[in-house]
C-alpha cells in the first residue's frame, strides 16, 4: 500500500490521543534504555510503511502484535485516514484469522514495540526544511 495520500495530521492526532497510551501500557515495566532503536524511517509515508510492517507482520519470536489494542487502533486509524487502505487489508485479515495464536508477550515483542515507538515519534515530528 502507498501511504502517500494519507491524512498524516489526523493519524498523528489518533496516535497522540490513544495509540501512544496503549503502547505505554504494553511496555509497562520495561526500561526505556533496555532496547536500542535500530529501525528508522525517512519521511511520513515511509514511517507508516515501517509501522504497518512491524505492527501487523509476524516476525521470528513475535507473532502476536496484530491482536493488541494499539494494533487494532492503528489499523482503524489507517483505515479511516488512508484512502483505499481497508480494501488492501481484507485478504491479509482473512489470512490472519486462520492462524490465530495465543497472545504471548515475549522479549522480542517488547523490543519490536520499542522500535514502533521510535517510528511513531519520527512520524509525528519530521524535521521540516526551512525555505
Amino acid at each position: 500500500y502507498d501511504f502517500t495520500n494519507c491524512d498524516f495530521e489526523k493519524i498523528k492526532a489518533a496516535y497522540l490521543s490513544t495509540i501512544s497510551k496503549d503502547l505505554i501500557t504494553y511496555m509497562s515495566g520495561t526500561k526505556s534504555t533496555e532496547f536500542n532503536n535500530t529501525v528508522s524511517c525517512s519521511n511520513r509515508p515511509h514511517c507508516l510503511t515501517e509501522i504497518q510492517s512491524l505492527t501487523f507482520n509476524p516476525t521470528a519470536g513475535c507473532a502476536s502484535l496484530a491482536k493488541e489494542m494499539f494494533a487494532m487502533k492503528t489499523k482503524a486509524a489507517l483505515a479511516i485516514w488512508c484512502p483505499g487502505y481497508s480494501e488492501t487489508q481484507i485478504n491479509a485479515t482473512q489470512a490472519m484469522k486462520k492462524r490465530r495464536k495465543r497472545k504471548v508477550t515475549t522479549n522480542k515483542c517488547l523490543e519490536q514495540v520499542s522500535q514502533l515507538q521510535g517510528l511513531w515519534r519520527r512520524f509525528n515530528r519530521p524535521l521540516l526544511k526551512q525555505q
Partner: antibody, heavy 120, light 111 residues
C-alpha cells in the same frame, strides 16, 4: 534517566567559530529530534535548529541558516552545534534539548547550558 | 513565522493568590483537534523546565496548582495558589509550524 551533558564555557573573538557538544546518556539517542536553543543575557529563548540523528537530517531557523551547522555522532550519542562568523550579539547561553517520547514537540530533557562569550 | 506574544511582561502576585499568564499566537497552532502549545518555567541559572504540554496536559512531576487552557490562538497558564518557589520566568512555545517559536517570556514575582 536520560541526561544531556554539554561542553564547557567558551570565550571567542569576533569573526571566529565555536563548536558546542551535547552528550546524551541513559537512553536511546538516534530516534529523538535534538534541538539547540540559545538565550542572550537577560533575554528570551531562541530556537536555532534541530537534527534527527537517525539519518542526520537537519532543520534550521532561517536567522542562523548561513552560520549554524548541527551534526550528530550516533556512535558516541553526541550532538554538535557550530556557529561561525561570531559577533558580540552571539554572546549567550546555548542549550541542547531533546524532544519528548511521543513527538508532541516539547522539550523534556535539557542540557545544563554552555556560555559562549564573544569579545575582542 | 508564528509570533507568540505573552502578557503581561511581568506580574507580581501575593503568596497564595492566583497568577494568570496569557499567550497569543499570530495564527492558530491547532491541528486535527489538538493544540500544539507548550509552557515552560525557567529559574535563574537553570535551563527551562516543561510545565504544560499540548495546551492543558501537566508535565511529569509538575504540581497540580499549575494548569493550562486555550485553543487556536489564545492560551492561558494559571497558577491557582502562588508559592515562593514559583518565582521564575514563564515561556510559551508553539510547535505546530516550523520554525519553532517561543513567547518573549513573563517574569513572575511575589507582591
Amino acid at each position: 534517566e536520560v541526561q544531556l551533558v554539554q561542553s564547557g564555557a567558551e570565550v571567542k573573538k569576533p569573526g571566529s567559530s565555536v563548536k558546542v557538544s551535547c552528550k546524551a546518556s541513559g537512553g536511546t539517542f538516534s530516534t529523538y529530534n535534538m534541538h539547540w536553543v540559545r538565550q542572550a543575557p537577560g533575554q528570551g529563548l531562541e530556537w536555532m535548529g534541530a537534527i534527527y540523528p537517525g539519518n542526520g537530517e537537519t532543520s534550521y531557523n532561517q536567522k542562523f541558516k548561513d552560520r549554524v551547522t548541527i551534526t550528530a555522532d550516533k556512535s558516541t550519542s553526541t550532538a554538535y552545534m557550530e556557529l561561525s562568523s561570531l559577533r558580540s550579539e552571539d554572546t549567550a547561553v546555548y542549550y541542547c534539548a531533546r524532544e519528548d517520547d511521543y513527538g508532541e514537540g516539547y522539550f523534556d530533557v535539557w542540557g545544563q547550558g554552555t556560555t559562549v562569550t564573544v569579545s575582542s | 513565522d508564528i509570533v507568540l506574544t505573552q502578557s503581561p511582561d511581568s506580574l507580581a502576585v501575593s503568596l497564595g493568590e492566583r497568577a494568570t499568564i496569557n499567550c497569543r499566537a499570530s495564527e492558530s497552532v491547532d491541528n486535527s483537534g489538538l493544540s500544539f502549545m507548550h509552557w515552560y518555567q525557567q529559574k535563574p541559572g537553570q535551563p527551562p523546565k516543561l510545565l504544560i504540554y499540548r495546551a492543558s496536559n501537566l508535565g511529569s512531576g509538575v504540581p497540580d496548582r499549575f494548569s493550562g487552557s486555550g485553543s487556536g490562538t489564545d492560551f492561558t497558564l494559571t497558577i491557582s495558589s502562588l508559592q515562593a518557589e514559583d518565582v521564575a520566568v514563564y515561556y510559551c512555545q508553539q510547535i505546530n509550524t516550523d520554525p519553532l517559536t517561543f513567547g518573549q517570556g513573563t517574569k513572575l514575582e511575589i507582591k
